[in-house]
Interface confidence: medium
Amino acid sequence: QNLFTKDVTVIEGEVATISCQVNKSDDSVIQLLNPNRQTIYFRDFRPLKDSRFQLLNFSSSELKVSLTNVSISDEGRYFCQLYTDPPQESYTTITVLVPPRNLMIDIQKDTAVEGEEIEVNCTAMASKPATTIRWFKGNTELKGKSEVEEWSDMYTVTSQLMLKVHKEDDGVPVICQVEHPAVTGNLQTQRYLEVQYKPQVHIQMTYPLQGLTREGDALELTCEAIGKPQPVMVTWVRVDDEMPQHAVLSGPNLFINNLNKTDNGTYRCEASNIVGKAHSDYMLYVYDPPTTIPPPTTTTTTTTTTTTTILTIITDSRAGEEGSIRAVDH
């Protein structure tokens, strides 16, 4: 056997090149036939009336033909024949790749609540072979479940992703990425997650700066509440007691002028939105005026309905009047 061919893989719409090569030429006739065994070229003559076939090279050792605007119907075995005695035949297989026509991502709901599991679907339509779909949340790869539908040698792939959302996922893209031999580079589509979550509440002491609260001093606390949607209600209450008469509430701020021992207690900032409610507590201890040496601690405790972490701010009075603040996780 001294007649050789090579298999051809081509993307739909592009050009396929078919080559019949003879190793030891003796000027025998070379012929190329299509999958229906119709003659495309006999020597340099084209009996088949399909102008998409063009002669690239004809000699005693090679018949090279191009097929332009390849379609899926062109797929199959093409036969090279060499009229020696006995005749020789070799075939080349043309495989046509079809990139996905359309890539669609569909998210079950536009807005999800933290902790909720949502379904995201991605469909790559009418490709050949079937597309591989990969999922990413940000740059983290996730595993979906794919189903393949075949119709007339073409494949539609639908991949389903079940995703449990967290507040950190708000604004993060969910990306459906396609891998296909007919696609170079990244073919992808994405949707951004919108996650609603209950408030996170944090109390900050804005005055006194050194953190030590003494009789006669003023106290200013600021309540920061972050949630989605942004909390509409931020309220200050005194736990198990009435708010002091001389306390002033201004939005997220609590002012208490001229502190005295009767102000000792727990002050709570509460915030809520449509998802839920959370609070943070500040334990106020009013120390004697500077003439006496103070006990060592003023504490702030942060609690929410979602976490067991308690943040305690400890004022360390070993450095004299200047207290240093340490954050301690319990």
Epitope: G138, N139, T140, E141, L142, G144
Partner: antibody, heavy 125, light 107 residues
Amino acid sequence: QITLKESGPTLVKPTQTLTLTCTFSGFSLSTSGVGVGWIRQPPGKALEWLALIYWDDDKRYSPSLKSRLTITKDTSKNQVVLTMTNMDPVDTATYYCAHRRVEWVTLAGNWFDPWGQGTLVTVSS
Amino acid sequence: DIQMTQSPSSLSASVGDRVTITCRASQGISSWLAWYQQKPEKAPKSLIYAASSLQSGVPSRFSGSGSGTDFTLTISNLQPEDFATYYCQQYNSYPLTFGGGTKVEIK
């Protein structure tokens, strides 16, 4: 208790195909979320991930070796088979199979626990 | 591919020491990192997953921390059985990749 054991030839000639079998117990490869991976370690060198097969027959391969690797599963026999074509002396290594651990079924990320004892494959003529 | 770089490649320590091994990813991997311990002629054993979660049955002297690109494995009170090679592995995305290993030897 999950256990895995690798079996296959200890000596392979260059250009030959290596076929390794991982036989496991304590879990089923038809259970959602389950997967089995293959990792190798050349003598005195680091670990290298090769391939992984999921319960739903989804297969993932190391890109640098993808053209040479095939991973398959036989759920009824509790076995996973790895074949590696065109073996070369640089493929001499201990080959491990391992059970895929995962926090959530949907997460593609994997770590492995436990591992099989490993099988040393030497490629030499 | 995400490259995982471990340091140091080897270290000498004594029983009772506190040992720290670091692992750096070439790009952010969130908290998708596992740590393994491997003793000579044995298979690796999982210690830590999700950067800081202790695998069941692993002593509490092992701890992991970090997120993004920089991670740490700490052994707080080194025991004789802890002398081994330690590997990190990212599972943020394919291909799964391992660090080059850190060998902990007796001083």
